[in-house]
């Protein structure tokens, strides 16, 4: 199809080569008169264009993208040729970073369903390039994570080392969606919950005397849980006493609940008190029986091949470690009566 | 491709480093990790050092391994093992960029600890 | 750290049949998980990306699912070839309160 009456874009991608980028782009279709597949709500010049754009389209994922070869060869299906770009909806996904992805992209509707359609498109001129300048080291990570239930915010990887007051408006997009109130290099957030976590993507112009172009970064931003403010607790066992039969096996089960960490070191060990002594007892390992957002259960366990008379002067204890403090739990082994 | 050197018998305390050689990879443009596997066990992951020459570790070896590379190789220093650190060493190339899903793996070189 | 919890640790199954094998993330990993296949004696081979995305030249017998915490990996249509051990693994990487990388316990897969 022709391409000359595409819509055009310029966008910019500036690379770190120590950070993990990635780069979007939206099909972001422009309003021919007429058309039922680019349609939305018309918008005076000052605002911007809300995504997604497919207001008149069923079905989102209805688009088709195409790298345009720098040769003059004829358009190529993107799904077709490149790994690491993946299309998501109307989106289409650059999973790693690279002068490669330098090019002109161009998507359209799927489905041309009237002459006016056949305009419905848009050409996307991307350049890719590695960061040069090394004045900004510590700028913002294009993972950020923002702990749950307290206040936080998300930074534009590349505007974030310039001042509030320097800083040009930014347009902040959110899983494709735009933010119309944020405007700054810096989205404030006063109580973080689940739903802030997701893709946001943040756009601003730069120009010189010749033309203008959108420098734009991708942050993935997840929620996670704060680090525990408590020592591990343990669950089982509960009673300080076991009965049990001499000359059987035996199998003591030391089960804790450790408090969600980032930096997460657990201690879960056996030892044996006898009289004045006590040594650490050499079991098997560890295993995690449940994994959850907040909290974690280890188990490990005590195995007597069988239970003697010594057994029954001893203690046997569970000790519990995390970076906050420990926690212990002894049993006594008690002979089993009848 | 990828082939890691330098595992041997080695005493607890004693100091060990694996090297990684690479053929046909640029170093400035793929994360390169290290990944171990102890006799019977699962996998293990160690660290990368990334596109810019930044190393990451996993917490539980951060002070016990150390990750660089010159531009041909990747190197794996395995400060004071202990009977724990026996285990096959793979080096892993990521996908690209600084990713941390690895397409390309060593044969593994193996590094037994014993008195 | 992020605790990468796979299970069950062996399964068997019967040429022609289904396995799923499940990988539950600590926390939250969008869809920044891998699966790897490996054999005795062989290192591990790449399966899937990005929580559902075949490797180039991976069957499409097999099938990767999930996001958030919770994924799967399906193996359909079994052949003698699968028998091997499967891992999960977390590629979320770097942010600004750590680094999150690492796998899962494993898994066996036994083909009668």
């Known amino acids: 199809f022709n391409i000359s009456g595409c819509s055009t874009k310029k966008l910019l991608w500036t690379y770190s080569t120590r950070s993990e980028e990635e780069f979007v782009l939206f099909c972001d279709l422009p309003e021919p008169q007429k058309s039922h597949f680019c349609h939305r709500n018309r918008l005076s010049p000052k605002q911007v264009p809300e995504h997604l754009p497919f207001m008149g389209s069923n079905d989102l994922s209805d688009v088709q993208w195409y790298q345009q070869p720098s040769n003059g060869d004829p358009l190529e299906d993107i799904r077709k040729s490149y790994p690491h770009i993946i299309q998501d909806k109307c989106t289409l996904h650059f999973l790693t970073p690279g002068v490669n992805n330098s090019g002109s992209y161009i998507c359209r509707p799927k489905m041309i369903k009237s002459p006016y359609d056949v305009a419905c498109c848009v050409k996307m001129i991307l350049e890719v390039k590695p960061q040069t300048n090394a004045s900004c080291e510590y700028s913002a990570s294009h993972k950020q994570d923002l702990l749950l239930g307290s206040t936080g915010s998300i930074s534009c990887p590349s505007l974030s080392c310039q001042s509030d007051a320097q800083s040009p408006a930014v347009t902040w997009y959110k899983n494709g969606k735009l933010l119309s109130v944020e405007r700054s290099n810096r989205i404030v957030v006063d109580e973080v919950y689940d739903y802030h976590q997701g893709t946001y993507v943040c756009d601003y112009t730069q120009s010189d005397t010749v033309s203008s172009w959108t420098v734009r970064a991708v942050v993935q931003v997840r929620t996670i849980v704060g680090d525990t403010k408590l020592k591990p607790d343990i669950l089982d066992p509960v009673e300080d006493t076991l009965e049990v039969e001499l000359g059987k096996p035996l199998t003591i089960s030391c089960k804790a609940r450790f408090g969600f960490e980032r930096v997460f070191n657990p201690v879960i060990k056996w030892y044996i008190k006898d009289s004045d002594l006590e040594w650490e007892v050499s079991v098997p390992e560890a295993k995690s029986i449940k994994s959850t957002l907040k909290d974690e259960i280890i188990e490990r366990n005590i195995i007597l091949e069988k239970v003697t008379q010594r057994d029954l002067r001893r203690k046997f204890v569970c000790f519990v470690q995390n970076s906050i403090g420990n926690t212990t739990q002894s049993v006594q082994l008690k002979e089993k009566r009848g | 491709s990828l082939e890691e050197s330098g595992g041997r018998l080695v005493t607890p305390g004693g100091s060990l480093t694996l090297t990684c050689t690479v053929s046909?990879?640029?170093?400035?443009?793929?994360?390169m990790a290290w990944v171990r596997q102890a006799p019977g066990k699962g996998l293990e992951y160690i660290g990368v050092i990334n596109t810019g020459g930044s190393a990451y570790y996993a917490s539980w070896a951060k002070g016990r391994f150390t990750i660089s590379k010159t531009s041909t190789t990747v190197d794996l220093k395995i400060t004071s093992p202990t009977t724990e650190d026996t285990a096959t060493y793979f080096c892993?190339?990521?996908?690209?960029?600084?990713?941390?899903?690895?397409?390309?793996w060593g044969p593994g070189t193996l590094v037994t600890v014993s008195l | 750290d992020i605790v990468m919890t796979q299970t069950p640790a062996s399964v068997e199954a019967a040429v022609g049949g289904t396995v799923t094998i499940k990988c539950q993330a600590s926390q939250t990993i969008t869809s920044y998980l891998a699966w790897y296949q490996q054999k005795p004696g062989q290192p591990p081979k790449l399966l899937i990306y990005r929580a559902s995305i075949l490797e180039s030249g991976v069957p499409s017998r097999f099938k990767g699912s999930g996001s958030g915490t919770e994924f799967t990996l399906t193996i359909s249509d079994l052949e003698c070839a699968d028998a091997a051990t499967y891992y999960c693994q977390c590629t979320y990487g770097t942010t600004n309160t750590g680094h999150y990388v690492g796998f899962g316990g494993g898994t066996e897969v036994v083909v009668k």
């Open positions: 892993a190339r990521s996908y690209g960029g600084n990713r941390y899903d690895f397409n390309i």
């Open positions: 046909g990879i640029d170093l400035s443009s793929y994360t």
